[in-house]
Amino acid sequence: MSITGISPITEYLASLSTYNDQSITFALEDESYEIYVEDLKKDEKKDKVLLSYYESQHPSNESGDGVDGKMLMVTLSPTKDFWLHANNKEHSVELHKSEKPLPDQAFFVLHNMHSNSVSFESKTDPGVFIGVKDNHLALIKVDSSENLSTENILFKLSETHHHHHH
């Protein structure tokens, strides 16, 4: 699975929440970032994430001259120079400072149930998705026989009208 271009095909800022409307928030603690899943108080500002979409070609014997087999990969950056990474050994989702080109662990295959309801599959561990476990983000194995609609791996993207990237 290779990224077909070094530049994202599109980027936008959105806030990320769980299927049950809990917010994904990011806090700087002891010089590293922690990720929380929590209920926000009314009027409390949601953290924003920069989603960068990349095209990826799936290795395939299919016809179509390379036209078929395209996937969308996303990277998620809540703050400058930090990206969500899959730690497949620990089954955890972590924020790490990285330089471009980003490591494969920072890329997730995008799935969606509708335009604003999405799931993120680890590029480095197919079948493993970002999910919610004990009020934290974790990597969750989804059995291929299961429907991807399982709620703990579904996230909502809501648009933001602020165009800065904090």
């Epitope: 095209e55 395939s60 087999g69 395209k70 969308l72 799935h111 335009s115 991807l148």
Partner: antibody
Framework: EVQLVETGGGLVQPGRSLKLSCVAS????????MYWIRQAPGMGLEWVSS????????YYLDSVKGRFTISRNNAENTVYLQMNSLRSEDTATYYC??????????????WGQGTLVTVSS | DIQMTQSPSVLSASVGDRVTLSCKAS??????LDWYQQKVGEAPKLLIY???NLQTGIPSRFSGSGSGTDYTLTISSLQPEDVATYFC????????FGQGTKVEIK
């Protein structure tokens, strides 16, 4: 080469039913969202229905909700549109389309040639 | 529901002209916008996806731009084979087409 072939159109009386089929080839069907889009004679395009790659999620235009049902058979590379209680305003060419990327509902990368449905007494 | 409004409805230009088609969304659609070309008697064809990405095999005279609610399709040098109706389409929230712009040669 990607191919989408729609069948099942024809002349039908108001209130009756029709089932459209779209047979796909040249790509891994089970990885893609599929769609039905229609175009009334001389008019613009109108999205009708969507189904995700595993068939577990379906979406409909408000005016067809409860009357139309989209489904798919991934083993046979086919997507269907069951149209019940047809109305004269459903008269259109119905196009089948495939998504642009695996697993996502973004863009219609390929379209079939369409099948004409005429609802008239 | 998001409404998409295209302008003009009909555009008449000469071969070689730079042509600009406009599409306005009723809400921010985060660049989740495509342009489709439909020639008479044919199925529509994807030209541009995610606002500014050219679909494989489409001539480079076609380009897209925009953000928020305002989007544009530009044909840098109109060719006779570009005579068609062009539809914008949003997929940020649900799926909605604009009503189309018919491009003719003067």
């Amino acid at each position: 080469e990607v191919q989408l072939v729609e069948t099942g159109g024809g002349l039908v009386q108001p209130g009756r039913s029709l089932k459209l089929s779209c047979v796909a080839s040249g790509f891994t069907f089970s990885n893609y969202w599929m769609y039905w889009i229609r175009q009334a004679p001389g008019m613009g395009l109108e999205w009708v229905s969507s189904i995700n790659n595993d068939g577990g999620n379906t979406y409909y235009l408000d005016s067809v909700k409860g009357r139309f049902t989209i489904s798919r058979n991934n083993a046979e590379n086919t997507v269907y549109l069951q149209m019940n209680s047809l109305r004269s305003e459903d008269t259109a060419t119905y196009y089948c389309a495939k998504g642009h990327y695996y697993y996502t509902s973004y863009s219609f990368a390929y379209w079939g040639q369409g099948t004409l449905v005429t609802v008239s007494s | 529901d998001i409404q998409m409004t295209q302008s003009p409805s009909v555009l008449s230009a000469s071969v070689g002209d730079r042509v600009t088609l406009s599409c306005k969304a009723s809400h921010n659609i985060n660049k989740h916008l495509d342009w489709y070309q439909q020639k008479v008697g044919e199925a529509p064809k994807l030209l541009i996806y995610f606002t500014n990405n050219l679909q494989t095999g489409i001539p480079s005279r076609f380009s897209g731009s925009g953000s928020g609610t305002d989007y544009t399709l530009t044909i840098s040098s109109l060719q006779p084979e570009d005579v068609a109706t062009y539809f914008c389409f949003q997929y940020n929230s649900g799926w909605t087409f604009g009503q189309g712009t018919k491009v003719e040669i003067k």
